[in-house]
Interface confidence: low
């Protein structure tokens, strides 16, 4: 039975050209995390494997950094980075847990005037 829950940073916004940290946390389970996949829509951004460590997709290597922890740092943000991001926790024996984050990348002038999502 899957008892765990995924907490995420929820809906977040950031300025174009800036950086953002995507964070998920798995709680309420003693299952062992074997791997975490970070995906953007249908694209695999990065994998953190318990045995092999991090692997960043080569097409994102210039703009994606591993961590902190099992999170992911996106750098040099563009408006095209707006969208859904998923953290997919592969665990044993529970199975797969998925968390969702929505990122909106704003033009600097918009972001400065406080048009932001609230982080739950």
């Amino acid at each position: 039975m899957m008892t765990g829950t995924i907490e995420t940073t929820g809906n977040i916004s950031a300025e174009k050209g800036g950086s953002i940290i995507l964070q998920c946390h798995l709680s309420s389970t003693t299952a062992q995390v074997t791997q975490v996949n970070w995906e953007q829509q249908d694209q695999l951004l990065a994998i953190c494997n318990a045995d092999l460590g991090w692997h960043i997709s080569p097409s994102f290597k210039d703009r994606v950094a591993p961590g902190p922890g099992l999170g992911l740092t996106l750098q040099s943000l563009t408006v095209n980075d707006t969208g859904e991001y998923f953290c997919i926790y592969h665990t044993y024996p529970d199975g797969t847990y998925t968390g969702r984050i929505f990122l909106e990348v704003l033009e600097s002038s918009v972001a400065e005037h406080g048009a932001r999502f609230q982080i739950p």
């Epitope: 695999l44 092999l52 460590g53 991090w54 692997h55």
Partner: nanobody
Framework: EVQLVESGGGLVQPGGSLRLSCAAS????????MGWFRQAPGKEREWVAS???????WYADSVKGRFTISADNSKNTAYLQMNSLKPEDTAVYYC???????????WGQGTLVTVSS
């Protein structure tokens, strides 16, 4: 000394197929991933596909559905099956691998693929 040796390149007609191989030797640790990049004349080197030691694969949008990457971990060898080749696939194809995460540690010398009628 670590070496990556590519083979399988050549001349093929549009719509044809080729299979590239990359044999890695000299590793103390098996590479955590192996992959393929390519460089067309007058263009920058671009990533094509990667395969992790655990079997996960992913591809550049330009080759999705046409190219398939695979690996034989016991032989430290990666393969790139290229189908439905187009003239724009003409390039020198380089094998690459990584032992520690974060950097592309090793490169092959490249193998030329020419797609032309």
């Amino acid at each position: 000394e670590v070496q990556l040796v590519e083979s399988g390149g050549g001349l093929v007609q549009p719509g044809g197929s080729l299979r590239l191989s990359c044999a890695a030797s000299g590793f103390t640790l098996s590479p955590s991933w192996m992959g393929w990049f390519r460089q067309a004349p007058g263009k920058e080197r671009e990533w094509v596909a990667s395969v992790l030691r655990g079997g996960y694969t992913w591809y550049a949008d330009s080759v999705k559905g046409r190219f398939t990457i695979s690996a034989d971990n016991s032989k430290n060898t990666a393969y790139l099956q290229m189908n439905s080749l187009k003239p724009e696939d003409t390039a020198v194809y380089y094998c690459a691998s990584e032992v520690a995460s974060g950097e592309t540690d090793y490169w092959g010398q490249g193998t030329l693929v020419t797609v032309s009628s």
